[in-house]
Interface confidence: low
């Protein structure tokens, strides 16, 4: 049915879906706090611009009786049920914030008359790529894939003189929502990553992974996995690892590597960690003080979603344009707006751009050090440490195939 939008005459409402099934196990109260903090900032910015309007959020909760797995498995129906609730109440805001699960976002996008923008903290999967009115504020799988291909092909750095064309991918099905979709993208036979690699095998059992570490007949020296150091330790323990094995540990939403007192455990010496640049941490923020690093990124994406809406609202109001139009719904892309802790850039498809950081463990200091950074906005790698103190021979990353000479 046609739902009227509470989005005119100086009153602008944001519909926030508070779903029990979520990409990260974050208490809904924390997300509410993030949204409310965002609203305060937006009101201040609009007031400073001389725009005397009201901006509020309506939090839409599901009943939690049917969809209570807590993760994303039953999110498809929960998302549609919440939309039905909005439809029955005949009340929709100018913008929909949430859902975070790929399943629910994909289904909601398919099943709705999208004359309004949808902003998601999550929706990492490839199935949510290239959606005209969807904006994603946490790095989607496509961005990871582009980094990996870029890095695999790189062969002109002092520490990486070989192009790689092979990889193992460890994926055992117990991953968090972000990792699940990142690895899913790498596994998909039609994906850019698979297309660019000559050899790729998915390891699904712990034993398969453990055997590869010392297998002389392995087809690649490179193993991609997703999770934190503890996850790796549970799997690898203190097992011996062949000297030319390189483990790429994708752990994007984790600031712990940058903390001053962190020492890298010995089992991380064969590992390159891919994470996100920690941003403007010198500015201590009140809202993030009680959040763990991962949850901070999730709550921050909700907050930035509010700030993005405020940014677009300001532009449209200043230009005297209508908010309840397809033009507004399609405008949340190809722009940079003022986020909570610095600029946030969205690409042509509404996906957040970021600086990815590849870390290594220094054999001298046992500290994580930045090897290179990658700007997803320009698809460019910037080397940082030109003479890293690697565990690998000659302080260079090995070839991806044992015994193959220079290319």
């Amino acid at each position: 049915s046609q739902v009227s939008q509470n989005c005119h005459n100086g009153s602008y409402e944001i519909s926030v879906l508070m779903m029990g099934n979520s990409a990260f196990a974050e208490p809904l109260k924390n997300l509410e706090d993030a949204v409310n903090e965002g609203l305060e900032i937006v009101r201040g910015r609009l007031q400073n611009a001389g725009l005397n309007v009201t901006v509020n959020a309506t939090f839409m909760y599901s009943d939690g009786l049917i969809h209570n797995s807590g993760d994303c498995r039953s999110s498809t129906c929960e998302g549609l049920d919440l939309l039905r609730k909005i439809s029955n109440a005949q009340r929709m805001g100018c913008v929909l914030i949430g859902p975070s699960c790929t399943y629910s976002t994909f289904q909601m996008y398919l099943d709705t008359e999208l004359s309004y923008p949808m902003i998601s903290a999550g929706s990492f999967g490839l199935s949510c790529d290239y959606k005209e009115t969807l904006t994603r504020l946490m790095s989607p799988a496509r961005k990871l894939m582009y980094f990996l291909v870029n890095f695999w092909k790189t062969n002109d750095l002092p520490f990486k003189t070989y192009s790689w064309s092979t990889s193992y991918v460890y994926k055992n099905g117990t991953e968090t929502e972000d990792c699940f979709w990142y690895l899913n993208a790498l596994e998909a036979s039609v994906s850019y990553f698979s297309h660019e690699l000559g050899f790729k095998v998915v390891l699904r059992q712990d034993k398969e992974f453990q055997d590869i570490l010392m297998d002389h007949n392995r087809k690649s020296n490179v193993i991609i996995m997703c999770g934190g150091p503890e996850f790796l330790y549970k799997l690898k323990g203190d097992r011996a690892v062949a000297e030319d094995i390189v483990i790429i540990l994708v752990d994007l939403f984790n600031d712990q590597y940058f903390e001053d007192n962190v020492t890298a455990p010995d089992y991380m010496k064969n590992v390159l960690v891919l994470t996100l640049s920690p941003g403007n941490s010198l500015l201590n923020s009140s809202f993030s003080r009680n959040l763990s690093p991962t949850k901070r990124d999730f709550a921050l994406a909700y907050l930035n979603g509010i700030l993005l809406f405020g940014h677009m609202l300001k532009i449209f109001l200043e230009n005297g344009e209508n908010i309840t139009t397809p033009k507004f719904a399609h405008a949340f892309r190809n722009l940079t707006f003022e986020g909570y802790d610095g600029p946030v850039t969205l690409d042509d498809w509404g996906d957040v751009d970021s600086t990815m950081v590849l870390l290594y463990t220094s054999v001298d200091t046992k500290k994580y050090k930045v090897l290179l950074t990658y700007d997803t906005h320009v698809n460019k790698t910037y080397p940082v440490d030109m003479s890293p103190t690697f565990t690998w021979k000659n302080s260079k990353l090995p070839n991806d195939i044992t015994g193959r000479g220079p290319q």
């Epitope: 640049s277 941003g279 610095g342 600029p343 050090k369 940082v384």
Partner: nanobody, 115 residues
Framework: QVQLVESGGGLVQPGGSLRLSCAAS????????MSWVRQAPGKGREWVAK????????YYVDSVKGRFTISRDNAKNSLYLQMNSLRAEDTAVYYC????????WGQGTTVTVSS
């Protein structure tokens, strides 16, 4: 390669002025916050000032407020620190830093305030 090169330090009398410069290269300078950090002899690094990517917000440590001014020129990929009313306790090696990565530091530029 990401590089930061500081210049402009020197010996100055108390009450005098200096202008430090930092030339940045190897990253998209105009998208990142920049900072000045200093390290006095025998002490740890101390954050001095920080400026937003477009120059619209600036933050200072209390001890330099009203005396130091941070600025930037994105067209030239340059960061500046204007230091007035210098005191003996401002003596230090001054470094510029970027939020692009915390692992890159220049060689620093030495400021000595002494009569």
């Amino acid at each position: 390669q990401v590089q930061l090169v500081e210049s402009g330090g020197g010996l100055v009398q108390p009450g005098g002025s200096l202008r430090l410069s930092c030339a940045a290269s190897g990253f998209n300078f105009g998208r990142y916050w920049m900072s000045w950090v200093r390290q006095a002899p025998g002490k740890g690094r101390e954050w001095v000032a920080k400026i937003k990517y477009d120059g619209s917000e600036k933050y200072y440590v209390d001890s330099v407020k009203g005396r130091f001014t941070i600025s930037r020129d994105n067209a030239k990929n340059s960061l500046y620190l204007q230091m007035n009313s210098l005191r003996a306790e401002d003596t230090a090696v001054y470094y510029c830093a970027t939020d692009f990565t915390r692992d890159v530091w220049g060689q620093g530029t030495t400021v000595t305030v002494s009569s």
